[in-house]
Every structure is written in structure tokens, then in C-alpha cells.
């Protein structure tokens, strides 16, 4: 069994996964808004969902941190929470969205001018999975202060979206995240129905660009519940 | 658009040796990188092995660490599962997926592995 890896600190009790993987009849593959999906067509729905567990922030998803549900709460007991939006406050970085950062408690925009380049981030990568580089040799991905002065390009290791290219965000890549293109109109998106909703994504997507929403694509509204297919479209 | 076609499961008995493949076709993006998982038993499929091209890295779960291997070649966009060792828990369709960068995920059908003790 894979329990040692449930146990892991990258993948714990997976919740229920979301409806939302269609498959193209005739085709030797599927397209899936998210990657860990059950087999045939039966998908279950969220309705009984239990928040999403996690040990560290990198485990949640772009929108969410890893903390306590309440103040003051167990310590050992911490789950996937929504992101805290501007001039809310926070006490790290990753509790702000996308787009901002932590500064003297209160979560403030990184406009263009502003680097955090004083903080150097390193993604530890301490699953029960084995992670070894196709060369051989062990890697520890450090991002330094030069990344925050060069925008990551596709594919570039990311904390967050604010550290990618305009255009791209920063979207789970196995263990990692990297920074893959913003969802754009007609793609299959992945609808969270609820905050922290979601399994862990091996291949994450990013989310809708600007103008898009991820909605039940029109002609399927007549297929079962939990099994409708997503995809950003036009408010 | 891609399709991934697996290959190469079959009957074998404990301790022996299979080695699966993938072949992605179709592809007119490039890909970040493939993995190999599995069903359990009342749970979703679960991840065995993967294969990052864009981090040069590979990934396997705790219960095959030792025993499988996965590899392959971008540029052929096909990927490989050699399983050594195999135990009748190992009994599961395999089946291979893509992180690809037009924001699709795809998974292929599946290979049936079926290790008898």
C-alpha cells in the first residue's frame, strides 16, 4: 500500500475528490481538471468534505495557508485556510494572497517597485517520497533574492504566483510548484466548491485569467453532478 | 490532441519483473512531466512514480522505493516503469499521466499488472 506515503508530510488523508474530469469518447485519454481522479465515472461529490490537513504551506493550495483554524487552537492540528486579502492581518507571507506579502502584520501589495529580495525561501522537500535529480545527484532548490528580480519564466520554481511571469502562476508540479500559464478561455479549469476543497494536485492548473470565471461548461449541465466539466469562460 | 497509450502489463509471479511504457502522441505542447499511478483498494488513484523534465527529477512512493524505476525521454515523449521485485500488492491497472503545459492533465486507460504469489 502507499500508507507510508499518507503519512508523509506531502500527502495526508486525501479528501473525496472534486466532480469535474470528462472524458473525450473515442480517446485513448482523458482530460482532468485535477490529477489524482478515480477510474470509470463515478465521481463523489464534496458534500461531507473535511478540511483539508496539512503540515506546512507549500501542502495547500495558491489561494491558502497552513495554520490552526482557531486562534490560539491545537497546534498539531492545522489545516489548509483561505488566504488573507490586503491590509488583513498576517504574520507571514504565505497567509497573504497572491499578489501581496506580509509587512509589520498587515498583508500589503508586492507592486513591480518592491522585491522581497532580503528574504531567501527554501522549498524543503521532506515527503516520504524519494525526490532524486535524473543526474543523480540530490538538489535543494533555494530561491534567493535574484529570483524576485526576475519574474519566473514557464516552468521556473515558484513559492507563489507573485513570483512568476505576468501571465503565469505558480501551480503544484509534484512535489514542487513551478509557473505555468494562466487558464485561458475554452481550457478545463479546476472548480473548488469550497475553500481548501481540493486533493492534493499532483499537476495543478493555474486558475481563470482576468475577465474568466471556471463554470460548468454549458453542455454539460445535463450530466451527472459529479462529473461536470469546468472551463473559464466570460463573466 | 494527446493521447497516452500504455503498455507492457501483464501476468507475473512474485518476485519477477515487468516494464511498462507510455507513449504520448498528438502533442503539440511541450510537457513538464509524466507519472505512473495506481488504485487502492476504497481509495483514489494513488501516485507511484513520476518523472519531472522540467526539474530534472524523479519521485517515487515509499512502497516501490527500491523496486521501481521509472525513466524515459521527452524528446520521444515516452516514459517507462521498470518494476522489479513485484509483490502481489503490486496488483493494480497502471496508469500514466502528463502535466502537460497546455493546462491539460491527461491520463491514459491503463495497464492491467496482476503479480500471483
Known amino acids: 500500500t502507499l500508507n507510508s506515503v499518507l503519512n508523509s508530510n506531502a500527502i495526508k488523508n486525501l479528501p473525496p475528490p472534486l466532480g469535474g474530469a470528462a472524458g473525450h469518447p473515442g480517446s485513448a485519454v482523458s482530460a482532468a481538471p485535477g490529477i489524482l481522479y478515480p477510474g470509470g465515472n463515478k465521481y463523489q461529490t464534496i458534500d461531507n468534505y473535511q478540511p483539508y490537513p496539512c503540515a506546512e504551506d507549500e501542502e495547500c493550495g495558491t489561494d491558502e495557508y497552513c495554520a490552526s483554524p482557531t486562534r490560539g487552537g491545537d497546534a498539531g492540528v492545522q489545516i489548509c485556510l483561505a488566504c488573507r486579502k490586503r491590509r488583513k492581518r498576517c504574520m507571514r507571507h504565505a497567509m497573504c494572497c497572491p499578489g501581496n506579502y506580509c509587512k509589520n502584520g498587515i498583508c500589503v501589495s508586492s507592486d513591480q517597485n518592491h522585491f522581497r529580495g532580503e528574504i531567501e525561501e527554501t522549498i524543503t522537500e521532506s515527503f516520504g517520497n524519494d525526490h532524486s535529480t535524473l543526474d543523480g545527484y540530490s538538489r535543494r532548490t533555494t530561491l534567493s533574492s535574484k529570483m524576485y528580480h526576475t519574474k519566473g519564466q514557464e516552468g521556473s520554481v515558484c513559492l507563489r504566483s507573485s513570483d512568476c511571469a505576468s501571465g503565469l502562476c505558480c501551480a503544484r508540479h509534484f512535489w514542487s510548484k513551478i509557473c505555468k500559464p494562466v487558464l485561458k478561455e475554452g481550457q478545463v479549469c479546476t472548480k473548488h466548491r469550497r475553500k481548501g476543497s481540493h486533493g492534493l494536485e499532483i499537476f495543478q492548473r493555474c486558475y481563470c485569467g482576468e475577465g474568466l470565471s471556471c463554470r460548468i461548461q454549458k453542455d454539460h449541465h445535463q450530466a451527472s453532478n459529479s462529473s461536470r466539466l469546468h472551463t473559464c469562460q466570460r463573466h | 490532441e494527446v493521447q497516452l497509450v500504455e503498455s507492457g502489463g501483464g501476468l507475473v509471479q512474485a518476485g519477477g519483473s515487468l516494464r511498462l511504457s507510455c507513449a504520448a502522441s498528438?502533442?503539440?505542447?511541450?510537457?513538464?512531466?509524466m507519472g505512473w499511478f495506481r488504485p487502492a483498494p476504497g481509495k483514489e488513484r494513488e501516485f507511484v512514480a513520476g518523472i519531472s523534465w522540467t526539474l530534472g527529477r524523479t519521485y517515487y512512493a515509499d512502497s516501490v522505493k527500491g523496486r521501481f524505476t521509472i525513466s524515459g525521454d521527452n524528446a520521444k515523449n515516452t516514459v517507462y516503469l521498470q518494476m522489479n521485485s513485484l509483490k502481489p500488492e503490486d496488483t493494480a491497472v497502471y496508469y500514466c499521466a502528463s502535466d502537460e503545459s497546455d493546462a491539460y492533465n491527461y491520463w491514459g486507460q491503463g495497464t492491467q499488472v496482476t503479480v500471483s504469489s
Open positions: 498528438g502533442r503539440t505542447f511541450s510537457s513538464y512531466g
